[in-house]
Amino acid sequence: SIPWNLERIIPAWHQTEEDRSPDGSSQVEVYLLDTSIQGAHREIEGRVTITDFNSVPEEDGTRFHRQASKCDSHGTHLAGVVSGRDAGVAKGTSLHSLRVLNCQGKGTVSGTLIGLEFIRKSQLIQPSGPLVVLLPLAGGYSRILNAACRHLARTGVVLVAAAGNFRDDACLYSPASAPEVITVGATNAQDQPVTLGTLGTNFGRCVDLFAPGKDIIGASSDCSTCFMSQSGTSQAAAHVAGIVARMLSREPTLTLAELRQRLIHFSTKDVINMAWFPEDQQVLTPNLVATLPPSTHETGGQLLCRTVWSAHSGPTRTATATARCAPEEELLSCSSFSRSGRRRGDWIEAIGGQQVCKALNAFGGEGVYAVARCCLVPRANCSIHNTPAARAGLETHVHCHQKDHVLTGCSFHWEVEDLSVRRQPALRSRRQPGQCVGHQAASVYASCCHAPGLECKIKEHGISGPSEQVTVACEAGWTLTGCNVLPGASLTLGAYSVDNLCVARVHDTARADRTSGEATVAAAICCRSRPSAKASWVQ
Amino acid sequence: QDEDGDYEELMLALPSQEDGLADEAAHVATATFRRCSKEAWRLPGTYIVVLMEETQRLQIEQTAHRLQTRAARRGYVIKVLHIFYDLFPGFLVKMSSDLLGLALKLPHVEYIEEDSFVFAQ
């Protein structure tokens, strides 16, 4: 007998469990940047500190009537969703509220920046336990707001932001577009994207995951025991902030990268109907609904990976796309995808001491995406081996020649523009285990890693008949680190990873032209981490 | 997620004709001016001046003061509303948009962003 949203995000085995840090006290603090709140509400009294921070613009309109309960409505509801006594996700968590939104729910980028700086100052003056910052607000893309989020995240603060309610690409909004924040879209009781009037939840590659955000019952500022239902990506973000608070309460040393990877790994997969999103955004939008993950003690040693898409390169001839992992993550592979199929491949290069995944558009192409596979590999030592393009008709082989290094990904980049000339690359696990094999005019890049107990293998699946895509999945206990398409005669659009599934896409028009003898193959590199074992290549 | 989205970036790197100050004439702006792509969300007249990452505390204050001085020379009054030290070096200023070209040529300035609205979601 609990509301749908709490049932959805908190698995049955967690329902009665109270999360406490090892010393018995819940030291996580959540900072809420929102409207004013009603601190005396039964849901949050004694748990909330209303700071004296107030940086809001004047309300619009000469006849605006400032009514306290309306001014407090949004913030009170969210405070209740995060840490409410009864309707909260992280019931005991202490919360600090900063007023950056006025009675009409409007604020400014500058006010938000001053609020974030206030948190940083508080952190410097009185260092405490883990901090979570909830940003249930959105404005247009702002370089400085994203930069401020990056700076705060690098001090160890976990920021959670609303994706936005504009039924649009979340990358066009801030702070939703900041890579260092956990960006949350909204789903309803049927696990479908939330519609809000003519608009709805934002989507796209800048969304990390979705969470309940429709008809969420929480504290109402109308009275100190009142409840009401509210909807939006703010509510969704508040659920994730609550989950993060609970995770940190159990394990205060979890980093942002670990938190994000665990949220993604343990979320409910493939329940969202992607048809709700614009067609060009469907492949970029994560099909993930948040749930409270078990602790690392219960699930230790798993290799956790996520897929990071770049921005679209744009259509110019030399346009490149760049996908980056978080500083703590290892880039284990890089692939590319183009809707037109006109791409010149992908490669990994070091920029400012960090490995990045790059993809290059081809002449006449509408643009490409770079697709990075970003993983948490404790004590990893990874390097890239590349071989320049072979002479016409010759194969290029690249393997991991350092001792105890295993192949985690392959990338291929063609020097030639003419797609008809080149024979696309192949990855042959049976003939040459642990090698990337390129063909005519392709530079080949092998991503090689050494980490305690890391073992990898290639898994291939080919389809000869007409098919828009070929997929291959890593089996339970293994994690997908690399994904490539090994084509037959047809033009391929590229390959990308969706959770543990490697998806190779083939050009629509090519399906009819295909001869049955030439299969399109999806090649996955699957790895696992067994801390006691030596690094090895599994044939 | 880190590329600039649907965002207006304008170069206002015009060398000043009217200012005879040697250091200013020598400094051609490489800084950019940015503002929200949604016109209705913009707050013209309020700007966040973002300085280079390594700018020291004293230099932030000097840059803000220098902008005030140079604006005054042109007959403009500007108001520094807030100085950012802890998350990034910079300051928030209320001024006429006429002064953007001048501000972009100040030493240490990386970019200037026009303030804009954010909304409860």
């Epitope: 006594r85 009864d86 009275c223 100190s224 025991t225 009401m228 | -």
Partner: antibody, heavy 123, light 107 residues
């Protein structure tokens, strides 16, 4: 039929503690907050606090913090109030009262009341 | 805490009369007000919630009204079983507070 059956009258000495029970029947125990109300002889009603039977979450009237402790036992659909360091001021009739749970968010009242438990503190 | 005041501590009326009991709050409570009936044997029942909503099973002769700080309970046609003490209670702000009660007697 909904019933809140309270434990019988108590006569206790000053300084002692007492635990009053309230057994619920005829409805789903976790669907209602359990409130406790004090009525001193010939006086009005005073709200002591409430408890959510789902998770044991409590709210107290500041006046009774440290005096009253509210608990529930879901398995027996019973709510308890313990009063400690008793003085003659604590002599009163104590009521338990069920009020609509939060996710029925239009319900902010005490629908059902127990018959009351008389507590006498005397040496 | 919000103080609830019932100025009339006792009230005598005849059967069939229309009786109004008033209650005022020390600050605006936005209609977050309930009325309870306590019989001489101590039994307590909810009559009206949220200023004017009749609780299920309560006779329609009971009605409530008011706004801001001033509220009232009306019994349109007094019956013998209505002999009781009536309490108003606010839930706008914690702690919940009750009025001092109005004792209704038959003339």
């Amino acid at each position: 039929e909904v019933q809140l059956q309270q434990s019988g009258p108590e006569l206790v000495k000053p300084g002692a503690s007492v635990k009053i029970s309230c057994k619920a029947s005829g409805y789903t125990f976790t669907d209602y907050y359990m409130n406790w109300v004090k009525q001193s002889h010939g006086k009005s009603l005073e709200w002591i606090g409430d408890i959510n039977p789902n998770n044991g979450g409590t709210s107290y009237n500041q006046k009774f913090k440290g005096k009253a402790t509210l608990t529930v036992d879901k398995s027996s659909s019973t709510a308890y109030m313990e009063l400690r360091s008793l003085t003659s001021e604590d002599s009163a009739v104590y009521y338990c009262a069920g009020g609509g749970i939060y996710y029925r968010y239009d319900r902010n009242y005490f629908d059902y009341w127990g018959q009351g438990t008389t507590l006498t503190v005397s040496s | 805490d919000i103080q609830m005041t019932q100025t009339t501590s006792s009230l005598s009326a005849s059967l069939g009369d229309r009786v109004t009991i008033s209650c005022s709050a020390s600050q605006g409570i936005s209609n977050y007000l309930n009325w309870y009936q306590q019989k001489p044997d101590g039994t307590v029942k909810l009559l009206i919630y949220y200023t004017s909503s009749l609780h299920s099973g309560v006779p329609s002769r009971f009605s409530g009204s008011g706004s801001g700080t001033d509220y009232s309970l009306t019994i349109s046609n007094l019956e013998p079983e209505d002999i009781a003490t009536y309490y108003c209670q606010q839930y706008s702000k914690l702690p919940f507070t009750f009025g001092s009660g109005t004792k209704l007697e038959i003339k």
